[in-house]
């Protein structure tokens, strides 16, 4: 079953390579278990950036080596991606799945264009 997912159109990463955005889904029921996946689309290639599952009201559990962190509040997921560089600029798509209880719902956002600008190196001071 399909579900609507909303996310901001554009986000600019900080000078430290950190970008945050909210992924909001219109839950048709009372989901207790949710899976969130962030995918990056660039040059028609799609790659998985990170994925997490969480029980409603609990923190998102990403893998240990994940570049993502996040928190949830109701039907909103606050996602933060770190370690970004200019080459990581692209469309970051939020995918939400309501895993339990049945029925299973799937929603895919339109994507957030994240722009990453590498900071200029500090000039050497004499």
């Amino acid at each position: 079953k399909a579900m609507h997912v909303a996310q901001p159109a554009v986000v600019l990463a900080s000078s430290r390579g950190i970008a945050s955005f909210v992924c909001e889904y219109a839950s048709p029921g009372k989901a207790t278990e949710v899976r969130v996946t962030v995918l990056r689309q660039a040059d028609s290639q799609v790659t998985e950036v990170c994925a997490a599952t969480y029980m409603m009201g609990n923190e998102l559990t990403f893998l240990d080596d994940s570049i993502c962190t996040g928190t949830s509040s109701g039907n909103q997921v606050n996602l933060t991606i770190q370690g970004l560089r200019a080459m990581d600029t692209g469309l970051y798509i939020c995918k939400v799945e309501l895993m339990y209880p049945p029925p299973y719902y799937l929603g895919i956002g339109n994507g957030t264009q994240i722009y990453v600008i590498d900071p200029e190196p500090c000039p050497d001071s004499d």
Epitope: T37, Q41, V46, T47, E48, A51, K95, L106, I108
Partner: nanobody, 119 residues
Framework: EVQLVESGGGLVQAGGSLRLSCAAS????????MGWFRQAPGKEQEFVAD????????YYADSVKGRFTISRDNAKNTVYLQMNSLKPEDTALYYC????????????WGQGTQVKVSS
């Protein structure tokens, strides 16, 4: 056109095992993910398990965790569901599904294979 064909269903006693297979045909492809869903008569469709190609990462519904194992053979374009310690509540029509890319949703579905667990 991609086709998914499930097999391996049947009638089994509670506590028994079955191994479902889902073979993809119709071209050369690399799926982002493949999964299993089930639907019991009069019930809503339920997610069972899936496996993502990227890291071979698996995910299971709590109701089957520790009893079911999903695996795939990329060379054969086949995904398997090993079901152990079956319970009467596992009785359902089991569907295989595949995603071409992570942002396309479940693009392809099989016709399903029936699993009946008697007590």
């Amino acid at each position: 056109e991609v086709q998914l064909v499930e097999s391996g269903g049947g009638l089994v006693q509670a506590g028994g095992s079955l191994r479902l297979s889902c073979a993809a045909s119709g071209g050369t492809f690399s799926f982002y993910g493949m999964g299993w869903f089930r639907q019991a008569p009069g019930k809503e469709q339920e997610f069972v398990a899936d496996i993502r190609t990227s890291a071979g990462r698996t995910y299971y519904a709590d109701s089957v965790k520790g009893r079911f194992t999903i695996s795939r053979d990329n060379a054969k374009n086949t995904v398997y569901l090993q079901m152990n310690s079956l319970k009467p509540e596992d009785t359902a029509l089991y569907y295989c599904a595949a995603e071409m890319s992570g942002i396309s949703g479940w693009d392809y579905w099989g016709q399903g294979t029936q699993v009946k667990v008697s007590s």
